[in-house]
């Protein structure tokens, strides 16, 4: 099946994806749209009042006016200058600033907490199944199976540290070799990048915002997938990661040290442990084929237990099992021995919500999944709103310049490497790459950080999470120290290798181009984002898993033709864009294939048919929620509400003149300014820091 041309045209013709650029409402103000009759909170204003300088003729004549969607929106200041304010206004402004900062930190806190709870929810829903993936004996011989198990388990438990710790304990117990563990670690690296992709989906309301956010999130996915694509075969052929890490581990005489520092967890744990507490050992025990663990609940009930050591008489199969003859005896039938048995006495119950409900893990998981996704979504919306109101004027200019500007020549190339270090440092502080990249996603969406800058930050985040793992390994008990350190180092060198492959030379920064291409497609066909998520994180890994279980012949039999077709399509695509003359006329484009095989349009029509009935009710709900939010946080009355609904009302693909559309901007105030309708702000609601 040929690729959709949208991906190919991602860079040369961005306007093609800018729905707003190709479809616009009639310029004459429509009375029905002039004022919003249903919203009494909104001041009646004209939606678009284009001044002569922005006439359609001019825009058609000057195609340069159509913005590159990847250019950051100009977050212009619409507030009164600090110098122009009176004392009361200045005090009010300061308090507003403090209020916004407190709100921002509050929502950020709950955002991080909801990510933690989301991980717990996924573990409750899919943790036991994930544990069983590990107990598959074929992992040893099939690196591809190891890889997809790493992906699936991490996706199911929403935590690469959980899957990594299972691998560590399995290696320590000799159930797994380091060689077999490496592909699992690579898979875990891929699986962990799903979190920020889910977070990006929350910004689906605004096309341009979603384009940037989704591309910013998937740059992580593409980096991991591409790294695996190159490094897994290299590792299988040379075992370089295993050899290098073995040498490092053997060259040091480690003493297990202090516990790895819990930095962000110190703040979030008091809250998240009131929601739910899990017994993570259960998943590891299932992975290690412990039959008793399969019936255990993951929800922790007893938090304070007293472990007592006592000597007990236990039966042994034969005298050979006796530590010494004097410690064994018989009752005439069975052979008995004395063993030190530890028994746990439950003292105090945990203090979380679900402790007394005795619900099955799946039920608790589903409840938490829904709640955490709602909280995550709500917090994200609020963070974006607050940041949108804070990041204006000089503040925005300073932040954007600081983050996105390169060092002066000849040190410009160093900027990216500094960003890698910043990403690593920040991840080390928050102790989670998911948290860091998820926090980065909305910033990319609203246009504070460019994808080009987000990329090295994300790569740094990958490094940061491995340094945390190395620290945790150094703090592990003697019996697991070597294996956990070697695995952590494998993870570290895998990410370093990936960075060396896909970062130093600008030409090799394929993940950026691929992410932008996907961002463009997803902005035009928003359902494709979910489609991508399902295919790359569930369907492909599950298919490979299934084929691997069927054995090598089946895997090769299915895999080779698929890989061959993909390579063929890629080569053809390359020739079409670079030197089409080489190809016969028929192969110079994809028109020889049915439309559904080279365009998303027919698929879009089918999906729209199914989702159509659900869009309007969802919209009303969206509007109401948005209005409540606006009232609660004191947004300006002009704040843009339910952008997704606006798009719906404007029609999915209305034919029109390619004029500058508000979708390319970040909020309506800005679009008005660009169109010349600058309105004096209400000093009660708008405030600029500088």
């Amino acid at each position: 099946m040929a690729p959709w041309p949208e991906l190919g045209d991602a860079q040369p013709n961005p306007s093609k994806y800018l729905e707003g650029a190709t479809s616009q409402q009639p310029i004459t103000p429509d009375k029905s749209k002039e004022t919003n009759k249903t919203d009494n909170t909104e001041v009646p204003v004209t939606k678009f009042e284009l001044l002569p300088t922005y006439s359609t003729a001019t825009l058609i004549e000057e195609p340069t006016e159509v913005d590159d969607p990847w250019n950051l929106p100009t977050l212009q200041d619409s507030g009164i200058k600090w110098s122009e304010r009176d004392a009361k206004g200045k005090i009010l402004c300061v308090f507003q600033g403090i209020g916004r900062l407190i709100l921002l930190l509050g929502f950020l806190y709950f955002f991080v907490c909801s990510l933690d709870v989301l991980s717990s929810a996924f573990q409750l829903v899919g943790g036991k199944m994930a544990g069983q993936f590990f107990s598959n004996s074929s992992i040893m011989s099939n690196p591809l199976l190891g890889l997809v198990i790493g992906v699936l388990v991490t996706v199911f438990v929403q935590s690469s540290s959980t899957s990594t710790s299972i691998v560590v304990s399995m290696v320590a117990s000799s159930l797994l070799t380091v060689r077999a563990a490496i592909p699992i670690i690579m898979g875990a690296n891929i699986g962990t990048s799903i979190t920020n992709t889910i977070v990006a989906l929350m910004q689906v309301g605004d096309r341009s915002e979603f384009r940037r956010a989704f591309a910013g999130a998937t740059v992580h996915d593409f980096f991991n997938w591409l790294s695996v694509l190159v490094l897994l075969p290299v590792e299988v052929a040379t075992h370089y990661l295993e050899v290098v890490t073995q040498l490092i581990v053997e060259s040091f005489h480690f003493k297990n040290g202090e516990d790895a520092p819990d930095l962000l967890k110190v703040i979030t744990k008091p809250f998240t442990k009131l929601i739910v507490q899990l017994d993570k050992k259960v998943i590891s025990q299932i992975a290690m084929n412990d039959e008793t663990a399969k019936n255990k609940s993951l929800v922790k009930i007893w938090c304070k237990t007293f472990t007592n050591m006592t000597q007990m008489n236990v039966t042994v199969p034969s005298m050979a099992n006796c530590t010494s003859p004097s410690l064994c005896w018989t009752d005439g039938i069975q052979i008995w021995t004395m063993k030190n048995v530890t028994y746990k006495e439950n003292i105090a119950k945990c203090q979380h919500i679900f402790v007394n409900f005795h619900l099955p893990d799946l039920a608790v998981g589903i409840i938490l999944l829904i709640i955490s996704l709602l909280v995550l979504c709500g917090c994200l919306i609020m963070i974006v709103k607050i940041l949108g109101s804070v990041l204006k004027g000089q503040v925005a200019t300073v932040i954007k310049k600081t983050i996105n500007t390169d060092f002066p020549f000849p040190f410009a190339w160093l900027t990216g490497y500094l960003a890698i270090l910043v990403g690593a440092g920040m991840t080390f502080i928050v102790q989670s790459s998911s948290v860091f990249t998820s926090a980065l996603t909305p910033l990319i969406g609203i246009g504070v950080i460019t994808i080009e800058r987000a990329y090295p930050l994300t790569l740094g985040s990958n490094i940061g999470t491995t340094t945390t793992a190395i620290l945790a390994a150094l703090a592990s008990p003697g019996n697991t120290l070597r294996s956990s350190l070697q695995i952590a180092l494998c993870h570290f060198f895998f990410n370093i290798s990936g960075i060396l492959l896909w970062y130093p030379i600008p030409f090799t920064r394929l993940p950026i181009r691929m992410a932008k291409g996907l961002g463009n497609i997803s902005a035009k066909y928003r359902w494709f984002a979910i489609f991508y998520l399902i295919i790359f994180f569930f369907l492909i890994p599950l298919t490979v898993f299934g084929l691997s279980l069927a054995g090598w012949p089946v895997l090769v039999g299915v895999g080779v033709p698929v890989v061959f077709i993909i390579i063929l399509v890629l080569c053809l695509r390359l020739l079409q864009s670079r030197c089409p003359r080489v190809l016969p006329k028929k192969l110079q484009n994809w028109n020889f294939l049915p439309l559904c095989m080279h365009s998303l349009k027919p698929w879009d029509a089918v999906i729209s048919k199914f989702t159509g009935p659900f869009q309007m009710p969802c919209c009303c709900c969206c509007r109401v929620c948005c209005r409540v939010c606006c009232l609660l946080c004191g947004c300006p009355k002009c704040c843009r509400c339910s952008k997704c609904c606006q798009d719906l009302e404007e029609g999915q693909e209305a034919q029109g003149v390619p004029v500058k559309a508000p979708e390319t901007f970040d909020n309506i105030t800005i679009s008005r300014e660009a169109q010349g309708e600058v309105r004096a702000p209400d000093s009660k609601t708008e405030c600029t820091a500088l």
Partner: antibody, heavy 120, light 107 residues
Framework: QVQLVQSGAEVKKPGASVKVSCKTS????????MHWVRQAPGQGLEWIGA????????SYNQKFKGRVTMTADTSTSTVYMELSSLRSEDTAVYYC?????????????WGQGTLVTVSS | DIQMTQSPSSLSASVGDRVTITCKAS??????VAWYQQKPGKVPKLLIY???TRHTGVPSRFSGSGSGTDFTLTISSLQPEDVATYYC?????????FGGGTKVEIK
């Protein structure tokens, strides 16, 4: 109280088989191991084997293996010990006994004994 | 099989005397040793198990000691009712084995 009542004395010809029964009462039958011990006239004690009535698991002295069979009937709380291919040296008093001291082979309750005489 | 060798095979002592019977195991049996008393024409009666633990109802004049291969039954003050044959038994290995017995008489 715990009681072990054995079947009466038996006189058997060499090569024949003897089946001695031991009816129990006063305790939960399936709880304790039942041991069989014999004592030849004027001689010491010799352990034949044991059975756990709860599962029917048995353990025999190698000396008697192939000749001895122990069974338990939970419906009547009775244990049986059958010794085949009798020889004159099998003439002895056969005791059934139980060990209420769990996990040990020290027997604390004994039946009254059954004299088995093997003579031609 | 583990052999349990008892000595002496018989002994005669006066009432109130301290009587010691020894039992030697052919291999290490830990502390899995029991002592029995069998009066003439009666069934054996358990006196001691786990080398030194007195069974219920056994007078305190009976005591046991030892570990590994050497074990001792001591009657601190011989009484007329103590006239009997005493057997040691190991329950460390199957088959359970008994000593040859020690006949105690009163002078």
């Amino acid at each position: 109280q715990v009681q072990l009542v054995q079947s009466g004395a038996e006189v058997k010809k060499p090569g024949a088989s003897v089946k001695v029964s031991c009816k129990t009462s006063g305790y939960t039958f399936i709880t304790y191991n039942m041991h069989w011990v014999r004592q030849a006239p004027g001689q010491g004690l010799e352990w034949i084997g044991a059975i756990y009535p709860g599962s029917g698991d048995t353990s025999y002295n190698q000396k008697f293996k192939g000749r001895v069979t122990m069974t338990a009937d939970t419906s009547t709380s009775t244990v049986y010990m059958e010794l085949s291919s009798l020889r004159s040296e099998d003439t002895a008093v056969y005791y059934c006994s139980i060990s209420t001291i769990i996990t040990t082979g020290a027997v604390d309750y004994w039946g009254q004994g059954t004299l088995v005489t093997v003579s031609s | 099989d583990i052999q349990m060798t008892q000595s002496p095979s018989s002994l005669s002592a006066s009432v109130g005397d301290r009587v010691t019977i020894t039992c030697k195991a052919s291999q290490d049996v830990g502390t899995a040793v029991a002592w029995y008393q069998q009066k003439p024409g009666k069934v054996p009666k358990l006196l001691i198990y786990w080398t030194s633990t007195r069974h219920t109802g056994v007078p305190s004049r009976f005591s046991g000691s030892g570990s590994g291969t050497d074990f001792t039954l001591t009657i601190s003050s011989l009484q007329p009712e103590d006239v009997a044959t005493y057997y040691c038994q190991q329950y460390s290995r199957i088959p359970l084995t008994f000593g040859g017995g020690t006949k105690v008489e009163i002078k």
